[in-house]
Amino acid sequence: DWVVAPISVPENGKGPFPQRLNQLKSNKDRDTKIFYSITGPGADSPPEGVFAVEKETGWLLLNKPLDREEIAKYELFGHAVSENGASVEDPMNISIIVTDQNDHKPKFTQDTFRGSVLEGVLPGTSVMQVTATDEDDAIYTYNGVVAYSIHSQEPKDPHDLMFTIHRSTGTISVISSGLDREKVPEYTLTIQATDMDGDGSTTTAVAVVEILDANDNAPMFEPQKYEAWVPENEVGHEVQRLTVTDLDVPNSPAWRATYHIVGGDDGDHFTITTHPETNQGVLTTKKGLDFEAQDQHTLYVEVTNEAPFAVKLPTATATVVVHVKDVNEAPVFVPPSKVVEVQEGIPTGEPVCVYTAEDPDKENQKISYRILRDPAGWLAMDPDSGQVTAVGTLDREDEQFVRNNIYEVMVLAMDNGSPPTTGTGTLLLTLIDVNDHGPVPEPRQITICNQSPVRQVLNITDKDLSPHTSPFQAQLTDDSDIYWTAEVNEEGDTVVLSLKKFLKQDTYDVHLSLSDHGNKEQLTVIRATVCDCHGHVETCPGPWKGGSGGGGSGAGVIAVIVVVVIAIVAGIVVLVISRKKRMAKYEKAEIKEMGEMHRELNA
């Protein structure tokens, strides 16, 4: 039959070449001469000419050694034609299977494999997997079947069989207990891969097993007992540095220390932190220590790691005896800020209060006092007793020194320690109001028209506090009531000044007496400028011909000078007949008023 069974050809054949493989034969050769040919990769297409066929005999030849790892199988077609070139058979499949020879050693995928395992793990724990490849066939033969083994282990501690390797998977695992990073941090295994499932060619590689740190070592104090001296009252003072050693990997969570005060700090005076570089425990004061209350503290400090212990380990404890050093403490005023009510205007030498300080120290130290800041200079302080007395007039209304009725004084206490220390206290004098100020109108100068005059509203102010203020009462004095009226409004805080009779354009003094609710009277002279105008006015219109009240021409200025000279020369006469003169001025004004009125009527 025109059929060829698959042809098996071992790779790496030694020849000689060409080498016969098989004879193609068609049974049609009885009837006619047959010519044979082959096609396909390895014959007439790349790789060309590996196989050939003798045209007349049909012998299939191999022309070179084959390499299974390059091409494992060739699929060719055999053809049979008659002398005239006509095909006498269908193309025939020719399968040439290249059989494997063990011509490759195993090759590890890396020269050095790196793996890691936690110290102290149980036998059976997987560490890593190594891989070796072999190009030879591992399906139909053992040529490419790799078996793994461990050739050697360095170091051989605690013994030489700490690891095993699975012969077929290459998985390295722990076989013995006793892995201790602190003793052996790394193992170097020489591993072997052997083909023929362990009976063939061998290759080696290195597997480095890093032993990872577990927190199997507790930090230990060195030393375990500490003694420290700390000045009292200091906050944030470094008391002591506690040193620990830990055999685990430096700067790892298994090495970094965590400190806790587990006893002796009932008052919560201390805190302990870990120094980031040295890993020491830094003990500091959280609150100031008080020598007088407790001169020694015995603290118990425990140390653990940031990471929990991997195995049960005892926790180390250190003892720190802290001696409190006595410090000369400053006297403390009691209270630190003292509020005292005192009436303003009390007589000089009158006692204000006693303000004293206490010394926290146990010794009976002498305390002396003095005033540190007394802005108005109103007070004195007895150095021995702390008695504060008035030496000036306390004035509640003094806006320069008094704010919201309070006068603030700072006092100082000094002990006789070595060196002496000082403490300060604040004395807040709340000044009680006295009716020592009368009411005052504002403004004290007005300008008003002598025809249809507008009422002048003046505000009344009184520096005192209620009840020494409104309601106010107003009264015109010194005959000012002839031409003027003064009325306090309903609220009692303003006074309305009105011109009730015509006055010629000039400046006049209006004598206004105001009294407060406590009948404190204050006389104020209002300077009234009367202008020739109607209704509302700001300044007098037109040239000013009046005396001292106006400004204007040179004649007016001369007139003023003349009046002044006359006043100096005849001063006594003026004093004697002052009232008559004043009346004469208002009378002249009255005559003028009557004339103006007459003029108006004629008009």
Partner: antibody
């Protein structure tokens, strides 16, 4: 009838070169592997070179490797042997022979004489 | 390389007599051996291939056989044209190697 006929032999000095030819007829030359075989003056036969039918692969014994080159021109039905660096021990009758039935040496030529002498 | 030891180097025999020539292979070559004859004019012809297969046109008095590493050519009844040189060639190992030859002479 398969016929092969050698030519190109002659006298050559040691170190010289010579090219032998072999003309084939009567068979499909391109389908057969071809060889050169020599017979020394003491009548011993020695294989010299072989070439595959397509000319892709060549084979030599160590004695001539690097000095002799076998080649073929299937279009001209001719086989060649280029000889260089000739030595006195290369003196021989050179035959061209074909493979047949996939084995050596089915058909032989009459031979051509090569004499290497100073 | 593989050595083929051919014996005898020469042999005298009479017409009609049967003779055997032997080649011994120094390594295993399987059946990969041929026998050649060389005429006095130098013409060479293959007689037997694959140890025992006769080439076309070769008389049936010629036969080949093998016994282990010894390979034999037997001529059952010598004829006058048979008194020539005979050579063996192995093609089971590279390089191809020949026997030294046997000269068959008429007695």
């Amino acid at each position: 009838v398969q016929l092969v006929e050698e030519s190109g032999g002659g006298l050559v000095k040691p170190g010289g070169s010579l090219k032998l030819s072999c003309a084939a007829s009567g068979f499909t030359f391109s389908s057969y592997a071809m060889s050169w075989v020599r017979q020394t003056p003491d009548k011993r036969l020695e294989w010299v070179a072989t070439i595959s039918s397509g000319g892709h692969y060549t084979y030599y014994p160590d004695s001539v490797k690097g000095r002799f080159t076998i080649s073929r021109d299937n279009a001209k039905n001719t086989l060649y042997l280029q000889m260089s660096s000739l030595k006195s021990e290369d003196t021989a009758m050179y035959y061209c022979a074909s493979y047949y039935y996939g084995i050596p040496f089915g058909y032989w030529g009459q031979g051509t004489t090569v004499t290497v002498s100073s | 390389e593989l050595v083929m030891t051919q014996s005898p180097s020469s042999l005298s025999a009479s017409l009609g007599e049967g003779v055997s020539l032997t080649c011994r292979a120094s390594q295993d070559i399987g059946i990969n051996l041929i026998w050649l004859r060389q005429e006095p004019d130098g013409t060479i012809k293959r007689l037997i291939y694959d140890t025992s297969s006769l080439d076309s046109g070769v008389p049936k008095r010629f036969s080949g056989s093998r016994s282990g590493s010894d390979y034999s050519l037997t001529i059952s009844s010598l004829e006058s044209e048979d008194f020539v040189h005979y050579y063996c060639l192995q093609y089971g190992s590279s390089p191809l190697t020949f026997g030294a030859g046997t000269k068959l002479e008429i007695k």
